[in-house]
């Protein structure tokens, strides 16, 4: 079935509306914002999640009074256009007709242009480097224990097979997780590394996308692994096209 049958919810995506109106009275869930049906037995695509996030009422989150020194982090958020499969459309435009090309994880890979900008294909992000800094601990984590625990986490929580976790590097307090997935490697039913990385990023920030699943409690041999900061780097199968003036 596509969702939790007993109470008709979507365990892998809380940003959905579910009702028992599927074939044979089965539970069917639709993503907020797009209204697209989602498969609740796997991760929802990042494009649909971003769209849902942008459509969610801004006051739906718990309000916290920020300190006067707080900086705004917009997370590079925008309201994306998704194709019928839930993937990012290669060309994204905002309401003021400014357009740009994105990769398969929705990150801009060209300079911004106008409506005449062409993005011939959706370029695949085949290598993701997740750079984490953990809070101080009594001692360094054992590298092989950390490696095994992170691979297990991606398999158990994000449905990503360990074969796509290319490496786990560790130099206290920095942990780097390398995800690699070429087009040829990705079989039907395989979770996309971009989607897994996005779910992981939201979990690390304490903004879990799962419904009724506890928050991320990552432990290595019983010792909690608490992340202070996260940086994610994306490498595309075709290098991005930015003008030289952007690089100076």
């Amino acid at each position: 079935h596509t969702a939790a049958q007993d109470n008709c919810t979507c365990p892998t995506n809380k940003m959905t509306v579910c009702s028992p109106d599927g074939p044979g009275g089965r539970c069917q869930c639709r993503a907020l914002g797009s209204g697209m049906a989602v498969d609740c037995s796997t991760l929802t695509s990042k494009c649909l999640l971003l769209k849902a996030r942008m459509s969610a009422p801004k006051n739906a989150r718990t309000l916290v009074r920020p300190s006067e020194h707080a900086l705004v982090d917009n997370d590079g958020l925008y309201d994306p256009d998704c194709d019928p499969e839930g993937r990012f459309k290669a060309r994204q435009c905002n309401q003021t007709s400014v357009c740009w090309c994105v990769n398969s994880v929705g990150v801009r890979r060209t300079d911004k242009g106008d409506l005449s900008l062409r993005c011939d294909e959706l370029v695949r992000t085949h290598h993701i480097l997740i750079d984490l800094r953990h809070r101080p601990t009594a001692g360094a984590f054992n590298h092989s224990d950390l490696d095994a625990e992170l691979r297990r986490l991606f398999r158990e929580r994000y449905r990503l097979h360990p074969k796509f976790v290319a490496a786990v590097h560790y130099e206290q307090p920095t942990i780097q997780i390398e995800l690699r997935q070429n087009t040829s490697q990705k079989a039907a039913g395989d979770v996309d590394i971009g989607d897994a990385a996005y779910y992981f990023e939201r979990d690390i920030k304490g903004e879990s996308l799962f419904q009724g699943r506890g928050g991320l409690d990552l432990r290595v041999r019983g010792e909690p692994l608490q992340v202070e900061r996260t940086l994610i780097y994306y490498l595309d199968e075709i290098p991005p096209k930015f003008s030289m003036k952007r690089l100076t």
């Epitope: 037995s41 691979r151 398999r155 158990e156 449905r159 699943r213």
Partner: antibody, heavy 120, light 107 residues
Framework: EVKLDESGGGLVKPGGSLKLSCAAS????????MSWVRQTPEKRLEWVAT????????YYPDSVKGRFTISRDNAKNTLYLQMSSLKSEDTAMYYC?????????????WGQGTSVTVSS | EIQMTQSPASLSASVGETVTITCRAS??????LAWYQQKQGKSPQLLVY???TLAEGVPSRFSGSGSGTHFSLKINSLQPEDFGSYYC?????????FGAGTKLELK
């Protein structure tokens, strides 16, 4: 001591249904991915279904997809396999297995098995 | 679907001998391979996973090797309790598939 006790097997007619159960003990059931594997009368091993630790993700081969459903009740330490539209080729010994914590689909403990015979 | 081909289908050996069973995958499975032992009338038992890692409690006379498409299980100095059937299984994604088995008999 890890124990996996299957039950629910028996003789069933083609097109019929059967629900297998597996009572687990001796380990933290809710922390482990679990699978069902069957062994045909010719002694071939065939993977049937897998469910992750909290029951969100399930996996099946094409041969049983849409006919078999794996589920679990972590409060009862029990794994289930609901089988419907049974065919003669489903005749086998069905084993409940625990997936190795770090072994990614390698099965480190197997139950004693429960026999399923599909015949008219 | 990845096909697993085991050889030989059966072999006879004596206590104290060293035997090797091989398993070939129809495509590259890197090191995602497990080996199981099944004694007559019993359930299978995990011996090796990730091609070469011995499961808990498995005697050191068993060793796994190989990567990519060719793998082997070696049993040094066969003991009476080692006779039975051996199966390989890839764990490189879904669907999981097993080899047809190798029956190891006492000569």
């Amino acid at each position: 001591e890890v124990k996996l006790d299957e039950s629910g097997g028996g003789l069933v007619k083609p097109g019929g249904s059967l629900k297998l159960s597996c009572a687990a003990s001796g380990f933290t059931f809710s922390s482990y991915t679990m699978s069902w594997v069957r062994q045909t009368p010719e002694k071939r091993l065939e993977w049937v279904a897998t469910i992750n630790s909290d029951g969100i993700y399930t996996y099946y081969p094409d041969s049983v997809k849409g006919r078999f459903t794996i589920s679990r009740d972590n409060a009862k330490n029990t794994l289930y396999l609901q089988m419907s539209s049974l065919k003669s080729e489903d005749t086998a010994m069905y084993y409940c297995t625990r997936v190795h914590y770090y072994g990614y689909d390698a099965m480190d403990y197997w139950g004693q098995g429960t026999s399923v015979t599909v015949s008219s | 679907e990845i096909q697993m081909t085991q050889s030989p289908a059966s072999l006879s050996a004596s206590v104290g001998e060293t035997v090797t069973i091989t398993c070939r995958a129809s495509e590259n499975i890197y090191s995602y391979l497990a080996w199981y032992q099944q004694k007559q009338g019993k359930s299978p038992q995990l011996l090796v996973y990730s091609a070469k890692t011995l499961a808990e409690g498995v005697p050191s006379r068993f060793s796994g090797s190989g990567s990519g498409t060719h793998f082997s299980l070696k049993i040094n100095s066969l003991q009476p309790e080692d006779f039975g059937s051996y199966y390989c299984q890839h764990h490189y994604g879904i669907p999981l598939t097993f080899g047809a088995g190798t029956k190891l008999e006492l000569k």
